[in-house]
Interface confidence: low
């Protein structure tokens, strides 16, 4: 399927509007720091190419590779060298090199300055002078500071933000209308900027066997009906998605996704029943919808997995003969009858299961060595299910900041050399499993909240790799991708660390904290209390909670003064004496 | 491409008999328990009957014991299925599948008895 001009083809099969929009997040993606207006710049020179190579696919450098095309567009900004540094010397590279060159250069926590929602009006105002640039400064926001945001959702999300304003900006009460929406656009975008991470993560550190694996797991849960041969045809489609979007080739990601969608709205019937209300939406919505869809129901009277994968006396036969579709194929079945479990649980017992056939397969009696192996999955499905019992038991009691202080005292001592922003905003994130997944029925707790920490603590893993600090963390990330998380939870306080000394400074606060929201107040009690740990690894529960008590009365005591900042001066120096004593 | 494509299938009386025969290609065929699957007009797929890859282990549902025979030649990587004392509700579209499948992922051959 090759075409004379690459461009021509993706500007074609995308049209205009959605070839703009993912040149824009490519660009943005990479050249993080370059203002909007620079990047504009090169996608009008780009799309502008792009249609003289429709109209002629001979022209001059029309047959140039994607890479080749954007690396000398990227390589053509003035400021490469003083506002990327090392990154210039991408340029110096030929392809494929240079485009690895600026994937390794990717930044998962950019130095930018948080958003700031304007007033509604002037959002309302910018909205209707300019449609098209409001549009593309979202997409230009989102993606430099989310360079591995999976770009054809990207477009999606802005569809549905173009909507709401379009909504609101004519209703009575405009704020009431909006600012609901744009929340959970915001909540909902990090999600997905943070799900997408985990899926290149996957890709890039375990390569395409371990992506394979999650996505047969997953959409065998899914589409439970649907025989081996279907999943891996989807399995294998969606990796090539994947790992085109995770290696910044989002034209190319963005047209294969859209044939998937389209493959699996013509196939419904060996697919899923629940297909059928995605499949009459418009594109950007019907992938998103596909992507998201629910289980299909189980089929009725599965035969048990015993007779195929443990009483067979050919099990070692097929398993030498085609190991990884064997493998696949255990999976799958496994999977398709437990959508209870965690993927990463799945992933667990296909791993458990190969290790005891590599032993047995090797036995004088082979059988008689595998005959227990299903026997052996009861501690590995047991560990997940006692750990959300416990900590749904945990948030139910304490509610989520509570929940939150309890994950954030816990990781701090795992892992103290941790950055404190870092361990705030991963306990924070962790604690939000108890809203998200406690309250749903036992039968999907477990796939809800092994899952999730998953993506969490991938986060956790790349901030790390950026700034290695501790050996612990750097093994449970690298070792082994589906055992991330029991790594994470079996760590426990590191007694090799040495306290952090007591620094007043960090405990020291101002009127300003009267003025922040509900949240910013949060994160400020919880940057207090990691550095509390930080000093006194060893402090006890009600230590911890009699400090934090006491902080919060005292903060409570001097936003309610006439003068805040002298009660501040006058009685911040008091708490921290009584803390020190307390902790002593 | 994974392609399973069924044939033997026809108008017969009650009474009679079939040799379905389903062709494989696009995968390692001797590694993977077939089975086959029927879907009778109206009504969802039931699994009918499961071989294990080497041909030893055969598993029926209790509507067809003792009537059919699942066989396989893994040589030709042909798996079949033998039909006798065919009753009216044996009527349905009979598909294979890899493994233990009740998911229809081919065009199936249709079975109808009837006088």
């Known amino acids: 399927d090759t075409h004379k001009s690459e461009v021509a083809h993706r500007f074609k099969d995308l049209g205009e509007e959605h070839f703009k929009g993912l040149v824009l997040v490519a660009f943005s993606q990479y050249l993080q720091q370059c203002p909007f207006e620079e990047h504009v710049k090169l996608v009008n020179e780009v799309t502008e190419f792009a249609k003289t190579c429709v109209a002629d696919e001979s022209a001059e450098n029309c047959d140039k590779s994607l890479h080749t095309l954007f690396g000398d567009k990227l390589c053509t900004v003035a400021t490469l060298r003083e506002t990327y540094g090392e990154m210039a010397d991408c340029c110096a590279k030929q392809e494929p090199e240079r485009n690895e060159c600026f994937l390794q250069h990717k930044d998962d926590n950019p130095n930018l300055p948080p958003l700031v929602r304007p007033e509604v009006d002037v959002m309302c105002t910018a909205f209707h002078d300019n449609e098209a640039t409001f549009l593309k400064k979202y997409l230009y926001e989102v993606a430099r500071r989310h360079p591995y945001f999976y770009a054809p959702e990207l477009l999606f999300f802005a569809a549905r933000y173009k909507a709401a304003f379009a909504e609101c900006c004519q209703a009575a009460d405009k704020a009431a209308c909006l600012l609901p929406k744009l929340d959970e656009l915001r909540d909902e975008g990090k999600a997905s900027s943070a799900k997408q991470r985990l899926k290149c993560a996957s890709l890039q550190k375990f390569g395409d066997r371990a992506f394979k694996a999650w996505a047969v797991a997953r959409l065998s849960q899914k589409f439970p009906k649907a025989e081996f041969a279907e999943v891996s045809k989807l399995v294998t489609d969606l990796t090539k998605v994947h790992t085109e979007c995770c290696h910044g080739d989002l034209l190319e990601c963005a047209d294969d996704r859209a044939d998937l969608a389209k493959y699996m709205c013509e196939n419904q019937d060996s697919i899923s029943s629940k297909l059928k209300e995605c499949c009459d939406k418009p594109l950007l919505e019907k992938s998103h919808c596909l992507a998201e869809v629910e289980n299909d129901e189980m089929p009725a009277d599965l035969p048990s997995l015993a007779a195929d994968y443990v009483e067979s006396k050919d099990v070692c036969k097929n398993y030498a003969e085609a190991k990884d579709v064997f493998l696949g194929m255990f999976l799958y079945e496994y999977a398709r009858r437990h959508p209870d479990y965690s993927v990463m649980l799945l992933l667990r017992l296909a791993k458990a299961y190969e290790a005891t056939l590599e032993k047995c397969c090797a036995a004088a009696d082979p059988h008689e060595c595998y005959a227990k192996v299903f026997d052996e999955f009861q501690p590995l499905v047991e560990e997940p299910q006692n750990l959300v019992k416990q900590n749904c038991e945990l948030f139910e009691q304490l509610g989520e900041y509570k929940f939150q202080n309890a994950l954030l005292v816990r990781y701090t001592k795992k892992v103290p050399q941790v950055s404190t922003p870092t361990l705030v905003e991963v306990s924070r994130n962790l604690g939000k499993v108890g809203a998200k997944c406690c309250k749903l029925p036992e039968a999907k707790r477990m796939p809800c909240a092994e899952d999730y920490l998953s993506v969490v603590l991938n986060r956790l893993c790349v901030l790390h790799e950026k700034t290695p600090v501790s050996e612990k963390v750097t093994k449970c990330c690298t070792e082994s991708l589906v055992n991330r998380r029991p790594c994470f939870s079996a760590l426990e306080l590191d007694e090799a660390y040495v306290p952090k000394a007591f620094n007043a400074e960090t405990f020291t606060f101002h009127a300003d904290m009267c003025t922040l929201s509900e949240k910013e107040k949060q994160v400020k009690k919880q940057t207090a209390l990691v550095e509390l740990v930080k000093h006194k690894p060893k402090a006890t529960k009600e230590q911890l909670k009699g400090v934090m008590d006491n902080f919060a009365a005292f903060v409570e005591k001097c936003c309610k003064a006439d003068d805040k900042e002298a009660c501040f001066a006058e009685e911040g120096p008091k708490f921290v004496a009584a803390s020190q004593a307390a902790l002593a | 491409q994974v392609q399973l494509v069924e044939s033997g299938g026809g108008l017969v009386q009650p009474g009679g008999s079939l040799r379905l025969s389903c062709a494989a290609s696009?995968?390692?065929?001797?590694?993977?328990?077939m089975s086959w699957v029927r879907q009778a007009p109206g009504k969802g797929p039931e699994w009918v009957s499961a071989i294990d890859s080497g041909g030893a282990d055969t598993r029926y549902a209790e509507s067809v014991k003792g009537r059919f025979t699942i066989s396989r030649d893994n040589a030709k990587k042909t798996l079949y299925l033998q039909m006798n004392s065919l009753k009216p509700e044996d009527t349905a579209v009979y598909y294979c599948?890899?493994?233990?499948?009740?998911?229809?992922g081919s065009q199936g051959t249709q079975v109808t008895v009837s006088s």
């Open positions: 599948t890899i493994g233990q499948s009740t998911s229809r």
């Open positions: 696009g995968f390692t065929f001797g590694s993977f328990g």
